[in-house]
Interface confidence: medium
């Protein structure tokens, strides 16, 4: 029989976390006790791996997505907020099919 | 080129299962989130699932808790919804959806790319 | 679940004219974060949906200027400036600020 992860809806303000501590807050919503969330220690990448990742801007961790990001530099755009931009923050889509 | 290939679909009996595979070239699999969005004949878009990058969470609709379960291989770059119990209103065709990028610090959740499809056809 | 409403449900054209879709959600669609996850798909005839526009008003990778989004809190528009043949689908608008994730039913652009 195959095995159905309970549902832990992401908290409606956790779509883009912003943790910067080792542990990131999870709230139970939904599942019962989390079931689905294997691994209950995960590290905040930020603070690992992707320590470095981002390099004119501040690495974010976007926890119930297990996906991390970039928060850009005013001048600065791109995956790794490595492209600088004439104009503040103008959206430039081209490089966005990475 | 991102590409997402479905396959899996079929003719299945009410009550029965299937299992829908999506396979995943053009981008680093593995950093995104990804989604199956169905489509019944002649109506609109229903979203299916929802599964995080290391497949630690997954979303469901109440339409289908309970009777579907997403996962993921990223080492094989592949998305799989697993069927079970299914009924004459699952017939549809299930894309396979990339959800990204992220991009300026903003995840906006947008299916960006989307595979063309595989048919579930659910009749007795 | 919040509810997306789109009209017109059917949209006739003359090649070379302004087209707007509406889309009105059953709730705010504004995010804690401050943002609003309003996404616009298209889907041509025969073929698997396409992203458009994404948070209202931001035009994906390669999509044509004149297609353009705009509103916010709970109604919003698609806009296409001067409507070309390629342009013959069906337009759908989606929510991912609140789960389930949500689309509209839908508007069929056609050529007259």
């Known amino acids: 029989s195959v095995r159905v992860e309970q549902v832990v809806k992401p908290p409606q303000n956790k779509t883009e976390s912003e943790n910067t501590s080792d542990k990131p807050k999870r709230k139970k919503k939904g599942g019962k006790n989390g079931k689905n969330r294997r691994n209950r220690k995960k590290k905040n990448p930020c603070n690992a791996e992707f320590q470095n990742f981002c390099i004119h801007g501040e690495c974010k961790y976007i926890e119930h997505l297990e996906a991390v990001t970039c928060k850009c530099q005013q001048e600065y755009f791109g995956e790794r907020c490595g492209e600088k931009s004439m104009k503040t923050h103008s959206m430039i889509d081209s490089s966005l099919s990475k | 080129e991102v590409q997402l290939v479905e396959s899996g679909g079929g003719l299945v009996k009410p009550g029965g299962s299937l299992r829908l595979s999506c396979a995943a070239s053009?981008?680093?699999?593995?950093?995104?989130?990804m989604s199956w969005v169905r489509q019944a004949p002649g109506k609109g878009l229903e979203w299916v699932s929802t599964?995080?990058?290391?497949?630690?969470?997954?979303y469901y609709p109440d339409s289908v808790k309970g009777r579907f379960t997403i996962s993921r291989d990223n080492a094989k770059n592949s998305l799989y919804l697993q069927m079970n119990s299914l009924r004459a209103e699952d017939t549809a065709v299930y894309y396979c959806?990339?959800?990204?990028?992220?991009?300026?610090?903003?995840?906006?959740?947008?299916?960006?790319?989307w595979g063309q499809g595989t048919t579930v056809t659910v009749s007795s | 679940d919040i509810v997306m409403t789109q009209s017109p449900l059917s949209l006739p054209v003359t090649l070379g004219q302004p087209a707007s879709i509406s889309c009105r959600s059953s709730q705010s669609l504004v995010h804690s974060d401050g943002n609003t996850y309003l996404h616009w798909y298209q889907q041509r005839p025969g073929q698997s949906p396409k992203l458009l526009i994404y948070k209202v008003s931001n035009r994906f990778s390669g999509v044509p200027d004149r297609f353009s989004g705009s509103g916010s809190g709970t109604d919003f528009t698609l806009k296409i400036s001067r409507v070309e043949a390629e342009d013959v689908g069906v337009y759908y608008c989606?929510?991912?600020?609140?789960?389930?994730?949500?689309f509209g039913g839908g508007t069929k652009v056609e050529i007259k």
């Open positions: 053009g981008f680093t699999f593995s950093s995104y989130p």
């Open positions: 989606s929510q991912s600020t609140h789960v389930p994730y949500t």
């Open positions: 959806a990339r959800q990204g990028p992220i991009y300026y610090g903003n995840y906006y959740y947008a299916m960006d790319y």
């Open positions: 599964i995080s990058t290391g497949g630690t969470y997954t």
